[in-house]
């Protein structure tokens, strides 16, 4: 025998208290598929979360983060504070990237500069807190008198003069 609840469309639930009638989801609840026996409570975007898409009878609300924060986790389950480029978020707040590392985003951690010499290349543009090193052609590729290319950095490459 076919389950009578299978006829209940999205936006309704199969109400066992009422002879399995397909009752509309109450306000602030939804069912995104048919045949549901309950409606799910709508997500509420409060505090540091803000509403990106309102809840409806057939779909949950979607949240993003207020300015100065960014989403983390599936479906923006958390909001994390933004930092400036050249910084990373620590337990004590936003801290500048250490020498030899960079972060070109408002989120995430500082990453080490690329070590050009591992690929047999030279440093074309020095790294900063905000930008990675730009590697140039390998020294062997340099034609004589090609003075426009920065010479290989000293042994402590990647090179970044202290600020």
């Amino acid at each position: 025998l076919q389950d009578p609840c299978s006829n209940c469309p999205a936006g309704t639930f199969c109400d066992n208290n009422r002879n399995q009638i397909c009752s509309p989801c109450p306000p602030n609840s939804f069912s995104s598929a048919g045949g549901q026996r309950t409606c799910d409570i709508c997500r509420q975007c409060k505090g540091v979360f803000r509403t990106r898409k309102e809840c409806s009878s057939t779909s949950n609300a979607e949240c993003d983060c207020t300015p100065g924060f960014h989403c983390l986790g599936a479906g923006c389950s958390m909001c994390e504070q933004d930092c400036k480029q050249g910084q990373e978020l620590t337990k004590k707040g936003c801290k500048d990237c250490c020498f030899g590392t960079f972060n070109d985003q408002k989120r995430g951690i500082c990453r080490p500069w690329t070590n050009c010499s591992l690929d047999g290349k030279s440093v074309l543009v020095n790294g900063t807190k905000e930008r990675d090193v730009v590697c140039g052609p390998s020294p062997a590729d340099l034609s004589p008198g090609a003075s426009s290319v920065t010479p290989p950095a000293p042994a402590r490459e990647p090179g970044h003069s202290p600020q």
Partner: antibody, heavy 120, light 109 residues
């Protein structure tokens, strides 16, 4: 907005089909079209509603069974009330209303109504 | 059958009065109750939904309360434009659950 049409004078035992055309929004799982009537000098009486999406689930007052049927044409964004075996006591203004999930399924939008008179 | 009973059926009041109308359901409907205002020759206007939420554009002098079987509509300070008939409605779908109340006519004292 909602606009009802199809009302008029009909003899007892006769039939009538009322229409309600919606504009500015579409019926959906969040907006159910409903019919309500009001006899002269009397209170409001709920007739029924129909699921606003593609399913044909209807919610009807018990007294309507066999005589009144609600249907919908989503392509025309129009809902209908088919009334059969009409009686003098069915004389009333018939309102079309939008029952909205966003308003706790309350009727947040109403048509002006169409008068149905059942008389010989 | 499910029923909603309003009281009083009519009342006379003056501008500035506090007016209270009650609505009793024959079985529990949680907070699924709406209140409407209707003036002669016009369709009803939604005032309150989910028992206590003010509908868009409705003045704050209107308020609703209650849950289960007993509900109240209050007009804190009656204004000239508030003389009308008021109806409660269960918005609990199915099994005849969407009945309207019997109505309360508010007239000038």
């Amino acid at each position: 907005q909602l606009v009802e049409s199809g009302g008029g004078l009909v003899q007892p035992g006769g039939s009538l089909r009322l229409s309600c055309a919606a504009s500015g929004f579409s019926f959906s799982a969040n907006y159910y079209p409903c019919w309500v009537r009001q006899a002269p000098g009397k209170g409001l009486e709920w007739i029924g509603c129909i699921y606003g999406g593609s399913s044909d689930i209807t919610y009807d007052a018990n007294w309507t069974k066999g005589r009144f049927t609600i249907s919908r044409d989503n392509s025309k964004n129009t809902v209908y009330l088919q009334m059969n075996s009409l009686r003098a006591e069915d004389t009333a203004v018939y309102f079309c209303a939008r029952s909205a999930w966003y308003s706790g399924w309350g009727g947040d939008l109403w048509g002006p109504g169409t008068l149905v008179t059942v008389s010989s | 059958d499910f029923q909603l009973t309003q009281s009083p059926s009519s009342l006379s009041a003056s501008v500035g009065d506090r007016v209270t109308i009650t609505c009793q359901a024959s079985q529990s409907i949680s907070n699924r109750l709406a209140w409407y205002q209707q003036k002669p020759g016009k369709p009803p206007k939604l005032l309150i939904y989910s028992a206590s939420t003010l509908a868009s554009g409705v003045p704050s002098r209107f308020s609703g309360s209650g849950s289960g079987t007993d509900f109240t509509l209050t007009i804190s300070s009656l204004q000239p434009e508030d003389f009308a008939t008021y109806y409660c409605q269960s918005t609990y779908y199915g099994n005849d659950g969407n009945a309207f109340g019997t109505g309360t006519k508010v007239t000038v004292k």
